[in-house]
């Protein structure tokens, strides 16, 4: 969590002389409470925007905004504390609105807003905005809270974000799955536009059973500059059992940017439609299917890696 | 001293009901997401259900959704859990515990443990 | 949702030995993974989080690392104290799932 560059930020509007200052989280008139105390914020909202810093990196930030209750207690405002909290970590950061002068009511409604709490991708947060000074220790709450979750990297505005892209979002592998003959599944993928490794995971299941029954990895040499935005071939040979045949496949780029963390694709091929006259599955079958994998034997394709290759190479 | 401290643990039939209570100490409570796991008699750890600071966030693992509900006062430092239409696989050591700033979760209670059987 | 495996489910070694846990997460969690050590009959204790970062208080013989979808605890010499049940837990986002746990004993 972090605050959108170090400009100046600003809260002032006409008829009101405000400061934005960092914030422990922990307002003084928690320590030392106020008899007379605000109402709490009305309408609290939390949206989605962009905003670019100083380098010209796009980030997704919180757009956060609120109204005032029209009572006579914002005359006792002095300020208000933004806090967002990153539900995974707990992390937490704040800002205080510090007023320098007094509000005073005029025909419209006070309204409020800050655009300046950078969030990550996928990341769920709780945003508090609590009207300063905070309430005695058994007054009404002054604070309004909301949750916020922050769409991932595949949502379409998302994915032209500087943390995004890093991860490899623009990248479009098109992954394309065909079933041979022999036991054999094609994937083919487009290559990206950088000479990069790739691994291509496969993972089959029976279609009753959550359990996987058998996966390999397939690794991909980093393409030379002729082969980028080519399309790569990886052919698998699949599980003897025909019931070992629900299939998903992962493609994993090691893009720079991202290394082990970048964005990976998936596809999922399920199991063909059996007809009634089609043959039990034996018991003797299932034998192998549930033998403990020593840590060591996930990847049972090390002797197999000679059928992965670039398209242009057939 | 950081200290949790559950309660409300108890032998109860199928179909029943416990609420658990959570007690902190030592801690600003108000400022921490909180969290609630359980242990199966000689099984591993089941994340149950976490509830943010100001209760505006809030998530239940699939096992006990629509029959759990996890419930917090900052006024009286307390979380709690209750535990509704229970069946006997909730039978469980039902911790509490508050999550480390930067991950993963650092202080937690010792248990109280929950038996359904008929 | 995201599936956490850990391998081995058992491991039984000499005392100052190298003991490595793998956990693997069925997607990318990044780097928001945690271990934790549990003694028997007693309470969970966090030993590493954000993947590689030491608990304070912690012995420096515990380390983490890993990233992705692949992560790894490792022991630079086991010690008769470090008898124990270990988890990995994966905190991403919501359902913050654990691992099935490596149970770890001296030979």
């Known amino acids: 969590l972090r605050l959108l560059d170090h400009r100046a930020l600003v809260c002032s509007q006409p008829g009101l002389n405000c400061t934005v200052k960092n914030s422990t989280c922990l307002d003084d008139s928690w320590i030392h409470p106020r008899n007379l105390t605000p109402s709490s914020p009305k309408d609290l909202q939390i949206q989605l925007h962009f905003a670019h810093t100083q380098q010209g990196d796009l980030f997704p930030v919180a757009h956060i905004e609120w109204t005032l209750q029209t009572d006579a207690s914002i005359l006792y405002l002095e300020g208000a504390e933004l806090s967002v909290l990153q539900l995974n970590t707990n992390e937490r950061l704040c800002v205080k609105f510090q007023f320098l002068s007094m509000l005073q009511h005029h025909r419209k409604r006070w309204r409020f807003s800050f655009s300046h709490f950078v969030v990550d991708p996928g990341q769920e947060y709780e945003v508090t905005v609590h009207h300063l000074p905070k309430p005695i220790p058994d007054g009404d709450p002054n604070h309004q809270s909301k949750n916020f979750l922050v769409p991932d990297c595949e949502h379409a505005r998302m994915k032209v974000t500087t943390p995004c892209m890093s991860s490899g979002s623009l990248w479009d592998p098109n992954i394309t799955v065909e079933t041979l003959e022999a036991h054999q599944l094609r994937v083919s993928f487009t290559l990206w536009n950088e000479s990069t490794p790739y691994q291509v995971l496969l993972e089959s299941f029976s279609d009753s059973e959550n359990h996987s029954c058998f996966d390999v990895v397939k690794q991909i040499f980093a393409p030379r500059q002729e082969e980028f935005h080519q399309r790569a071939n990886v052919t698998f040979t699949l599980s003897k059992f025909h019931w070992c045949c629900h299939h998903h496949v992962q493609v994993q780029p090691f893009f720079s940017s991202c290394l082990n963390d970048c964005l990976r694709h998936a596809v999922t091929v399920p199991c063909p439609v059996i007809s009634n006259t089609t043959v039990p599955k034996p018991v003797a079958d299932y034998i192998p299917l549930w033998e403990p994998r020593s840590g060591s034997s996930d990847y049972k394709d090390d002797d197999d890696k000679g059928s992965s290759h670039h398209h242009h190479h057939h | 001293e950081v200290q949790l401290v559950e309660s409300g643990g108890g032998s109860v039939q199928p179909g029943g009901s416990l609420r658990l209570s959570c007690a902190a100490s030592?801690?600003?409570?108000?400022?921490?997401?909180m969290n609630w796991v359980r242990q199966a008699p000689g099984k591993g750890l089941e994340w149950v259900s976490i509830?943010?600071?100001?209760?505006?966030?809030?998530h239940y693992a699939d096992s006990v959704k629509g029959r759990f509900t996890i419930s917090r006062d900052n006024a009286k430092n307390s979380l709690y859990l209750q535990m509704n239409s229970l069946r006997d696989e909730d039978t469980a050591v039902y911790y509490c515990?508050?999550?480390?700033?930067?991950?993963?979760?650092?202080?937690w209670g010792q248990g109280t443990t929950v038996t359904v059987s008929s | 949702d995201i599936q956490m495996t850990q391998s081995p489910s058992s491991l039984s070694a000499s005392v100052g030995d190298r003991v490595t846990i793998t956990c693997r997460a069925s997607?990318?969690?990044?780097?928001?993974l945690a271990w934790y050590q549990q003694k028997p009959g007693k309470f969970p204790e966090l030993l590493i989080y954000?993947?590689?970062t030491l608990q304070s208080g912690v012995p420096s013989r515990f380390s983490g690392s890993g990233s992705g979808t692949d992560f790894t605890l490792t022991i630079s010499s086991l010690q008769p104290e470090d008898v124990a049940t270990y988890y990995c837990q994966k905190y991403n986002r919501a359902p913050f799932t654990f691992g099935p746990g490596t149970k770890v004993d001296i030979k």
């Open positions: 954000a993947a590689s």
């Open positions: 509830i943010s600071s100001r209760s505006s966030i809030i």
């Open positions: 515990a508050r999550p480390k700033v930067g991950g993963g979760m650092d202080v």
């Open positions: 030592g801690f600003t409570f108000s400022s921490y997401s």
């Open positions: 997607q990318g969690i990044s780097n928001y």
